[in-house]
Interface confidence: low
């Protein structure tokens, strides 16, 4: 098909006359608004068909779509159609009139629709508003079609300004109809069962009166059919339930169970699936790692957590040094085992304001008639270090010694430092580290003892100072993973008559 002029969009003057020509290899015809306007059809000597549409005394109402199509499309390979859009800017025509049914837009699902308000002039600015609102809505506008987007159930009008007057369109009403779609839910009494136990599944549909259920399941594939039971839940309107019950499950019953529901009125359907696992026997399985050495800080609370999978539900016991633990009435220990999913459990032992005596060997045991698992770890109580004693003495040898004693868990490190300029120490001058050099000035001797009952280390360190010629600030710092503590003593030379 050949259209002259080709378009696809033309802007014509009001009151003018315009000729449209369409030609093709078979009879052709012009269509306007599903009608065939008066036109001149001809057949040329070369066998070409044509149709001439003469538009006279054009007005804004001539704005719109024009189609050229084959008069009789039978026998042609393609149902070809050429579209042309003509604008006739006309200040006397505001918005092009709509048929009554175009003012009411019905939809059954959330989908894009078009509010078909059109003007005669492609240069005009058109805005969309809610019927009772002044704010222009941010919806794209196509001069040939209107506003397209997703709209709520409201009334809308279009506005434009022609010359100096504001023009409103008719109101458009958008209605969303509630067609009952199928919504299926499937659940099982248990998704994990032991062989010999029952599998029971339920498939529920809401909001429909007549539906058809179809189950697919592993047993069906081997030709062993199970007859489901369908019932209505009387206390809930339009709740229909199908129950699939397989007594004495076998290992081969593991797999996917699918409930497919159809309703014939609107030809809707939905399906949901659920996985069922049939196990040979029950199990208890630890999930994740728990280090075999755990730490808690003295006087702080500590929760020790073990995550495991089990079926059937297990009994969980906690032991300390082979003695069973229970929730203490004093609130010092709290035990809890939570079911976080059908087969997953979290067991927690909470020690409130941890005491040294709570260090030891802890075991969690989860068991049922088929299986058991134990998890053990050593709990170490970390105690912040403290310097218990820092003293200075003058042995007969002439050297001066400083002794530092402290305790903590884990084993504290000891750091000796000294400062000679008392006025500027330690704010301005950093102290000098002692005991880790090969200089003869100082000598260090450190002993470490582990006190079993208190479950902590004691560090005793003696610093020997060969020669002290002026007052010296000596600092002993103890450090471990949970803290540090420092004490300071001023060492004066033998010759000075006083000590600070």
């Amino acid at each position: 098909l050949v259209v002259t002029p080709p378009g696809p969009e033309l802007v014509l003057n009001v009151s003018s006359t315009f000729v449209l020509t369409c030609s093709g290899s078979a009879p052709v015809v012009w269509e306007r608004m599903s009608q065939e306007p008066p036109q001149e059809m001809a057949k040329a000597q070369d066998g070409t068909f044509s149709s001439v549409l003469t538009l006279t005394n054009l007005t804004g109402l001539d704005t719109g779509e024009y189609f050229c199509t084959h008069n009789d499309s039978r026998g042609l390979e393609t149902d070809e159609r050429k579209r042309l859009y003509i604008f006739v800017p006309d200040p006397t025509v505001g918005f092009l009139p709509n048929d009554a049914e175009e003012l009411f837009i019905f939809l059954t699902e959330i989908t894009e629709i078009t509010i078909p308000c059109r003007v005669t002039d492609p240069q005009l600015v058109v805005t969309l508003h809610e019927k009772k609102g002044d704010v222009a809505l941010p919806v794209p506008y196509d001069h040939q079609r209107g506003f397209s987007g997703i709209f709520e159930d409201r009334s809308y009008i279009c506005k434009t300004t022609i010359g100096d007057r504001e023009v409103d369109s008719d109101a458009y009403y958008v209605y969303r109809l509630q067609v009952s779609s199928i919504n299926v839910s499937v659940n099982a009494v248990q998704t994990v069962v032991r062989q010999g136990e029952n599998i029971t599944l339920m498939c529920i549909v809401i909001g429909n009166e007549v539906v058809n259920f179809e189950w697919t399941y592993p047993r069906k594939e081997s030709g062993r059919l199970v007859e489901p039971v369908t019932d209505f839940l009387l206390d809930m309107p339009y709740h229909i339930r199908s129950i699939l019950h397989i007594p004495s499950a076998e290992l081969e019953d593991s797999g996917t169970y699918t409930c497919n529901v159809t309703e014939s009125v609107n030809d809707h359907q939905d399906e949901k699936a659920i996985n069922i696992t049939v196990v040979e026997s029950g199990y208890v399985r630890l999930l994740g790692e728990v280090g075999t050495l755990q730490f808690a800080e003295l006087h702080r609370s500590r929760t020790l957590q073990v995550v495991f999978e089990a079926y059937p539900p297990p009994t969980v016991l906690w032991f300390k040094d082979n003695r069973t633990l229970g929730d203490s009435s004093a609130g010092e220990i709290a035990l809890s085992t939570r079911n976080v999913s059908e087969t997953r459990y979290v067991s927690e032992l909470t020690l409130v304001r941890v005491k040294v005596a709570e260090a030891g060997h802890y075991t969690m045991r989860a068991f049922h008639e088929d299986a058991e698992v134990q998890l053990s770890f050593q709990l170490q109580i970390n105690v912040p270090v403290r310097v218990l004693e820092l003293s200075e003495s003058h042995p007969d040898s002439g050297e001066q010694t400083v002794r530092c004693r402290g305790r903590g868990m884990p084993q504290p490190n000891i750091i000796w430092s000294a400062c000679r300029d008392l006025k500027r120490c330690p704010r301005e001058l950093p102290p000098t580290l002692l005991g880790n050099s090969s200089e003869e000035e100082s000598q260090l001797e450190t002993n470490v003892t582990y006190w079993e009952e208190e479950q902590e280390f004691e560090v005793v360190s003696t610093l020997r100072l060969q020669h002290v010629d002026r007052p010296l600030s000596v600092r002993c710092t103890l450090r471990n993973a949970v803290g540090q503590d420092t004490q300071e003593v001023i060492v004066v030379p033998h010759s000075l008559p006083f000590k600070v």
Partner: antibody, heavy 125, light 103 residues
Framework: AVTLDESGGGLQTPGTALSLVCKAS????????MAWVRQAPGKGLEFVGE????????FYAPAVKGRATISRDNGQSTVRLQLNNLRAEDTAIYYC??????????????????WGHGTEVIVSS | LTQPSSVSANPGETVKITCSGS???YGWYQQKSPGSAPVTLI????QRPSNIPSRFSGSKSGSTGTLTITGVQAEDEAVYYC???????????FGAGTTLTVL
């Protein structure tokens, strides 16, 4: 990602001692047992030994018992295999391995869940 | 631990490799060439690490562990070792290895 880098392999003389070091990264080293596994030329995998996460327990294969010592430094995330009195049959690729699992009161069960690329040791005069 | 020395299969077939011993828990390891680092396929009889394809699965019946490869592929050609996980008295042990040939 878990990485295990072995070092210390090479040509060794029979009767001498071997020291292999494995540097670990990408996981909480102090929470996991570590193991050494070797593979002699043309042979299968052979467990050498394992050390518990706190270094409180070590387990050795019969072929190296009495000659092997596995130690670890949780601060540096390293594990060391010392093998004394080397023999020609100690020639192998030595793999450092991260062992996961659970220690129970009576024993440990573990499996290897990460492997190093291996370091080759040749014992020859 | 006892396992067959070799098995062969055509692409797409299912292969089962057994490992018999007295372990309560088996692991399975794949080594594609001698001297290359092994890869852990299965631990604790049937647990599969997240980076291992689902065609590898493990099971245990009685005292025998089984590694199953469903729909074998050319790249699965390798030596497969089973290992026990008991550490009560000595270090763990490995089977002698099974060579899988994909025809």
């Amino acid at each position: 990602a878990v990485t295990l880098d072995e070092s210390g392999g090479g040509l060794q003389t029979p009767g001498t001692a071997l020291s292999l070091v494995c540097k670990a990264s990408g996981f909480t080293f102090s929470s996991f047992n570590m193991a050494w596994v070797r593979q002699a030329p043309g042979k299968g995998l052979e467990f050498v030994g394992e050390i518990s996460n706190t270094a409180g327990s070590t387990f050795y294969a019969p072929a190296v018992k009495g000659r092997a010592t596995i130690s670890r430094d949780n601060g540096q995330s390293t594990v060391r295999l010392q093998l004394n009195n080397l023999r020609a049959e100690d020639t192998a690729i030595y793999y450092c391995a991260k062992a996961a699992g659970t220690c129970y009161s009576h024993s440990c069960t573990g499996y290897i869940d990460a492997w190093g690329h291996g370091t080759e040791v040749i014992v020859s005069s | 631990l006892t396992q067959p020395s070799s098995v062969s299969a055509n692409p797409g077939e299912t292969v089962k490799i057994t490992c018999s011993g007295s372990s309560s828990s088996y692991g399975w390891y794949q080594q594609k060439s001698p001297g290359s680092a092994p890869v852990t396929l299965i631990y604790e009889n049937n647990q599969r690490p997240s980076n291992i394809p689902s065609r590898f699965s493990g099971s245990k019946s009685g005292s025998t562990g089984t590694l199953t490869i469903t729909g074998v592929q050319a790249e699965d050609e390798a030596v497969y070792y089973c290992g026990n996980a008991d550490r009560s008295n000595s270090a763990g042990t490995f089977g002698a290895g099974t060579t899988l040939t994909v025809l």
